[in-house]
């Protein structure tokens, strides 16, 4: 029987910069029941606080609700693991909420085959940013990535769309049914999950184009 091993806070995420959650990995348990507590202070403070919510984020987590989340101040936190034989502490972790945002997937993905009379046909898609993300403040730049594949294919083809919320793809296999998805990430945050798949049937008379794709 030993004191617990050193825990590690390995992940912090915010869906929208208004709340966030951090998760830790326990070290070895020393063969005894172990209690974990997360304490933190904000930059410029000396007063330590305990995690406000150990429940919402699941096991080995700390959730900071709206009233505990500030974008303006860095959080300095550590986890303490304690059993009957002693304690161990994680390394201190510094968290700036701006840089842990993992948004929800983009919304309202629509995909259409466009067949203009004077030009080659193309696949056109558009989407909306996730609702929880406030892009009007200016500091929040969302980047988008699209992936698509014929329904029965194994490999996805991915395209980086930058900040655009529309995209054209010019080279597709006629007669195939395609799955299309989009995801987003803030410039310094994390990729969202992929949006639910949208299906599109490519007409048999769709003419393959020499060019592969381009931004709209």
């Amino acid at each position: 029987q030993l004191p617990p091993g050193k825990p590690e806070i390995f992940k912090c995420r915010s869906p929208n910069k208004e709340t966030f959650t951090c998760w830790w990995r326990p070290g070895t348990d020393g063969g005894l029941p172990t209690n974990y507590s997360l304490t933190y202070h904000r930059e410029g403070e000396t007063l330590m606080h305990e995690c406000p919510d150990y429940i919402t984020g699941g096991p080995n987590s700390c959730h900071f609700g709206k009233q505990y989340t500030s974008m303006w101040r860095t959080y300095v936190m550590m986890v303490n693991a304690t059993n009957q034989m002693g304690s161990s502490f994680s390394d201190e972790l510094y968290v700036d909420v701006t840089y842990i945002v993992q948004p929800d997937p983009p919304l309202e993905l629509t995909v259409e085959v466009k067949q203009p009379e004077d030009r080659k046909p193309y696949l056109w898609m558009k989407w909306s940013p996730p609702t929880l993300i406030d892009l009007k403040t200016g500091w929040f730049t969302l980047l988008y990535e699209i992936r698509l594949k014929p329904e029965k294919a194994a490999e996805w083809e991915t395209h980086f769309a930058g900040q655009q919320t529309e995209f054209k793809i010019l080279s597709l296999h006629p007669g195939q049914k395609y799955l299309v998805q989009v995801r987003c990430k803030p410039d310094h945050g994390y990729w969202s999950a992929w949006s639910p798949a949208t299906f599109i049937q490519i007409p048999s008379d769709f003419i393959m184009n020499d060019h592969h794709h381009h931004h709209h």
């Epitope: 590690e8 390995f10 992940k11 912090c12 990995r25 930059e43 410029g44 974008m71 303006w72 860095t74 390394d91 972790l93 510094y94 968290v95 700036d96 701006t98 840089y99 842990i100 403040t137 200016g138 500091w139 990430k185 310094h188 994390y190 990729w191």
Partner: antibody
Framework: QVQLQQPGAELVMPGTSVKLSCKAS????????IHWVKQRPGQGLEWIGE????????NYNQKFKGKATLTVDRSSSTAYMQLSSLTSEDSAVYYC???????????WGQGTLVTVSA | DVVMTQTPLSLPVSLGDQASISCRSS???????????LHWYLQKPGQSPKLLIY???NRFSGVPDRFSGSGSGTDFTLKINRVEAEDLGVYFC?????????FGSGTKLEIK
Amino acid sequence: QVQLQQPGAELVMPGTSVKLSCKASGYTFTSYWIHWVKQRPGQGLEWIGEIDPSDSYTNYNQKFKGKATLTVDRSSSTAYMQLSSLTSEDSAVYYCGRSFFTNWFAYWGQGTLVTVSA
Amino acid sequence: DVVMTQTPLSLPVSLGDQASISCRSSQSLVHSNGNTYLHWYLQKPGQSPKLLIYKVSNRFSGVPDRFSGSGSGTDFTLKINRVEAEDLGVYFCSQSTHVPFTFGSGTKLEIK
């Protein structure tokens, strides 16, 4: 404890390439961005770019685009920077650094001295 | 790119004195999220830089309280009260508000 291990030195020929390594230990490699910084002898520091090991997403200083390529090998918890078409201007110490969940970095490797010489 | 100008380039001090280093940026370092990402590093001979102060005035873990940072916008100062021998080296300011991140040219703190 957190460590970023870099080889001490590399001697390379002009016109060739070199791939510098930065082996991370003591933490979950995919959690934090890795930065690369150049320091020429007796001079200041220049930020080259950064990479997110979780998905290999990169941001580069425009000045080093085409010169530096950042990659990671998640299986060995190692970050790499390849420098191409080397000239004497590329002779410098190159540091890797690790951020927290922040945009500044507190942990640095010991640096690799790259000497470009025929 | 944001240019960081440090003064003085060299700062001779006697042990126990106060030292003050100035850093000026070519544009405001207030991020659109309201934070100011101005940091100070110390590089001792033959070593990699070590973080002293993050976001203008916050001491990093383990940094003695004789180090303090202040300033706003484009003008920033690092003060060292009662300089000790272990404080000697080159001090760099750095900004991470704007990409690319940039550093000052350094201030060498040396014994008078």
